[in-house]
């Protein structure tokens, strides 16, 4: 992991980082769960999607999310998951034409229907953390991560390197 000054220097550079190509380099269909093995689920309510963090009953099917990986021109660091020395950004889509968006004003994570090219609010820097966990840092607000708060996804400010490993911003990806 990197020190506090490293976080600040790195996150400042995020503001300027652009996606190398408009096309993802690869995609992966996975279920998303928290560090404590609660599932991230998506429910269609009143023509819009709600995001929940919940314990599923045994044998209950997990919702899948399509992670689309994009290369950034900004070099990767120790914590970021990179390819060919470039930082990786992801978008997350639980169903066709809907993507997770960072709402920085409300500190919330929302699902919005939109067309490509996607807005910056839909992009998150992927960090590979310990124990096969990942975290998602907002492209539009460096130092702010997708996290869990009161059984919902929320945006959580991380202001020191120690907090990069805090459980409420860590997620697990699995094929099952």
């Amino acid at each position: 992991a990197f020190g506090i000054s490293g976080v600040q220097k790195y996150t400042r550079a995020l503001h300027d980082s652009s996606i190398t190509g408009i096309s993802p380099i690869t995609e992966y269909l996975a279920s998303l769960s928290t560090y404590n093995d609660q599932s991230i689920t998506f429910a269609l309510e009143d023509e819009s999607y709600e995001i929940y963090v919940e314990d599923l009953k045994k044998d209950e099917k997990k919702d899948k999310v399509l992670l689309s990986y994009y290369e950034s021109q900004h070099p990767s660091n120790e914590s970021g998951d990179g390819v060919d020395g470039k930082m990786l950004m992801v978008t997350l889509s639980p169903t066709k034409d809907f993507w997770l968006h960072a709402n920085n004003k409300e500190h919330s994570v929302e699902l919005h229907k939109c067309e490509k090219p996607l807005p910056d609010q839909a992009f998150f820097v992927l960090h590979n953390m310990h124990s096969n966990c990942v975290s998602f840092e907002c492209k539009t607000d460096p130092g702010v991560f997708i996290g869990v708060k009161d059984n919902h996804l929320a945006l959580i400010k991380v202001d020191s390197s120690e907090n990069l490993c805090t459980e409420n911003i860590l997620f697990k990806l699995s094929e099952t």
């Epitope: 190509g21 096309s23 690869t26 995609e27």
Partner: antibody, heavy 128, light 108 residues
């Protein structure tokens, strides 16, 4: 630097099984966000995708070859393998292994692939 | 499956000239999931372009891709001696992925 190397017999008899292995060096199959695959090229002809695999073992095959193909992965050896049964002279080709980007199509709920790093290829001749 | 038709079959040009290679799909696809490869005799193909227009790592900027729907183009702005080879397009919008028949760029 990521490198892929194919290995296996260069001559296979008709009706027998073709077996090839691809060894990945300079990177881990397991930690990759990418997929892995096999492509072949008959003498003087174009390219044909055989199939792809994710490190978890999930496979994707060309429907035209699906009944005869098995692709498997051994993460402990950083290798993945191809088995093609009941071969004929039409299976004579240069066989390439490659790293692949996988892209999902929501409409038919399937993955398709492009190949960004290739092995040098190995020639397999089917003949008695 | 999507059939890709490349034209011309052979392109005879001199070093320094501009090469324009065409790839036409039998069905339209909205994703622009099209790749271009270069293959020299006795060698494996090398990825040049993915996503119709994104250059792969280490590919010189004289190579550019464009197009959408059914019509795609690979342009080599100024041919270098090492660019004379066979070029293949490939779609990965739908499974099974398919390749074009190739265009040979030869020295005039």
């Amino acid at each position: 630097e990521l490198q892929l190397q194919e290995s296996g017999p260069g001559l296979v008899k008709p009706s027998e099984t073709l077996s090839l292995t691809c060894t990945v060096s300079g990177g881990s199959i397991r930690s990759s966000i990418f997929y892995w695959g096999w492509i072949r090229q008959p003498p003087g002809k174009g390219l044909e995708w055989i199939g792809s695999i994710y490190y978890s073992g999930r496979t994707y095959y060309n429907p035209s070859l699906k009944s005869r193909v098995t692709i498997s992965v051994d993460t402990s050896k950083n290798q993945f393998s191809l088995m093609l049964t009941s071969v004929t002279a039409a299976d004579t080709a240069v066989y390439y292994c490659a790293r692949a980007g996988g892209l999902y199509n929501w409409n038919d709920e399937s993955f398709s692939f492009y190949m960004d790093v290739w092995g040098q290829g190995t020639t397999v001749t089917v003949s008695s | 499956e999507i059939v890709l038709t490349q034209s011309p079959g052979t392109l005879s040009l001199s070093p320094g000239e501009r090469a324009t290679l065409s790839c036409r799909a039998s069905q339209s696809f909205s994703s622009s999931y099209l790749a271009w490869y270069q293959q020299k005799p006795g060698q494996a193909p090398r990825l040049l372009i993915y996503g119709a227009s994104s250059r792969a790592t280490g590919i010189p900027d004289r190579f550019s891709g464009s197009g959408s729907g059914t019509d795609f183009t690979l342009t080599i702005s100024r041919l270098e001696p090492e660019d004379f080879a066979v070029y293949y397009c490939q779609q990965y919008d739908r499974s099974p992925l398919t390749f074009g028949g190739g265009t040979k760029v030869e020295i005039k």
